[in-house]
């Protein structure tokens, strides 16, 4: 269940997809990845206020309990709901190879 | 890939399964759930230091970028990796019914 997409904190403040430009050095990949040398990393960033993009029943429970016990139970967290695959050219013992990673770039976000 | 299970912050401080006792009132379910009247809610709580229980490549990237840009990129977050089903007896228009929810109780945790 994908609950409310209206952010009560103001535009762009709630859980959504952001793009962060990163070099292979930034990612700690310079020793094994050859290409791309720059990655447009998409990730899920933002607040998860009550019922905003609640991923499931667990997220709804978490919201309720966080309201009751904020020091014990954290608010739901903005995480990927799905991913875009990405191809990397990487070093191998014998040369180079192309490898597709299915869990690298966030495609869509929700709160859990 | 499930990375290190050793918590550098001390025992019990890192991402793990916690149980929180909650009444139907706490959960806001009193008007539609009849049983159980008290739920042992299992949820994922705790810090996600570098590579601790990293769910996938995305989590590893997030750790690297959080280290570089802590004000822009949040640390990975402790969320359910899987769930335990739970049966609720709930009110219906015609009486009561048993309903199994597959996404209610966290079974296992990871960082993402």
């Amino acid at each position: 269940a994908r609950n409310g997409d209206h952010c009560p904190l103001g535009p762009g403040r709630c859980c959504r997809l952001h793009t962060v430009r990163a070099s292979l050095e930034d990612l700690g990949w310079a020793d094994w990845v050859l290409s791309p040398r720059e990655v447009q990393v998409t990730m899920c960033i933002g607040a998860c206020p009550s019922q905003f993009r609640a991923a499931n029943m667990h997220a709804q429970i978490k919201t309720s309990l966080h309201r009751l016990k904020p020091d014990t139970v954290p608010a739901p967290c903005c995480v990927p709901a799905s991913y875009n695959p990405m191809v990397l050219i990487q070093k191998t013992d014998t040369g180079v190879s192309l490898q597709t990673y299915d869990d690298l770039l966030a495609k869509d976000c929700h709160c859990i | 890939a499930r990375n290190g299970d050793h918590c550098p912050l001390g025992p019990g401080r890192c991402c793990r399964l916690h149980t929180v006792r909650a009444s139907l009132e706490d959960l806001g379910w009193a008007d539609w759930v009849l049983s159980p009247r008290e739920v042992q809610v299992t949820m994922c709580i705790g810090a996600c230091p570098s590579q601790f229980r990293a769910a996938n490549m995305h989590a590893q990237i997030k750790t690297s970028l959080h280290r570089l840009k802590p004000d822009t990129v949040p640390a990975p977050c402790c969320v359910p990796a899987s769930y335990n089903p739970m049966v609720l007896i709930q009110k219906t228009d015609t009486g009561v019914s048993l309903q199994t929810y597959d996404d209610l109780l966290a079974k296992d945790c990871h960082c993402i």
Partner: antibody, heavy 119, light 112 residues
């Protein structure tokens, strides 16, 4: 089978603009970069610029800066190249190509769109 | 911009014989990771270009092993060990060490 399908041939007047499209069908679009390369009749290949569809960030060759705009629509898996203030020297076949950032590796090319600029 | 210079301009070949094309760059294409960011493309008559070699010496998927790329820094060579009739077309080298990407002028390979 992934393909890059380009829009049809265009005939344009000098001074006008043209917008060529490139649609990725049958595969992932977002995690590759799309570059635009042109080829004037009987000439070689010339890189115009490219875009990361996932972020919408574009990069252009200095020669075309201010005259070319490259955009992408993730929802339709389509990239666009718009060239303005057309002159006869812009008569060429315009190709889109899929690559890994700007590191080359253009492993997939569209069939090309012929743009003729003539008064 | 990096200038790419190819020679010869035209290369008449006999089927079954070897062929060699040279490509020179005005700046080094050797990146700090020890790899050369140079591709070779073949454009067959009436067709779009196709990738033959990437990162200086790596054959693209489906490319016959009679094609090989070599060289480093500013001097590169594409070799065809035994030319076949289907190899006719224009061969281009392209540098990808930096933007703007630039192509060589092309070498037209034709059967004698």
């Amino acid at each position: 089978q992934v393909q890059l399908v380009q829009s049809g041939a265009e005939v344009k007047k000098p001074g006008s603009s043209v917008k060529v499209s490139c649609k990725a069908s049958g595969g992932t679009f977002s995690s590759y970069y799309i570059s635009w390369v042109r080829q004037a009749p009987g000439q070689g290949l010339e890189w115009m610029g490219g875009i990361a569809p996932i972020s919408g960030t574009a990069s252009y060759a200095q020669k075309f800066q201010g005259r070319v705009t490259i955009t992408a629509d993730e929802s339709t898996s389509t990239a666009y190249m718009e060239l303005s203030s057309l002159r006869s020297e812009d008569t060429a076949v315009y190709y889109c190509a899929r690559g890994l950032a700007y590191d080359g590796y253009f492993d997939l090319w569209g069939r090309g769109t012929l743009v003729t600029v003539s008064s | 911009d990096i200038v790419m210079t190819q020679s010869p301009l035209s290369l008449p070949v006999t089927p079954g014989e070897p062929a060699s094309i040279s490509c020179r760059s005005s700046q080094s294409l050797l990146y700090s990771n020890g790899y050369n960011y140079l591709d070779w493309y073949l454009q067959k008559p009436g067709q779009s270009p196709q990738l033959l070699i990437y990162l200086g010496s790596n054959r693209a998927s489906g490319v016959p092993d009679r094609f090989s790329g070599s060289g480093s820094g500013t001097d590169f060579t594409l070799k065809i060990s035994r030319v076949e009739a289907e190899d006719v077309g224009v061969y281009y080298c392209m540098q990808a060490i930096g933007v703007p990407l630039t192509f060589g002028g092309g070498t037209k390979v034709e059967i004698k």
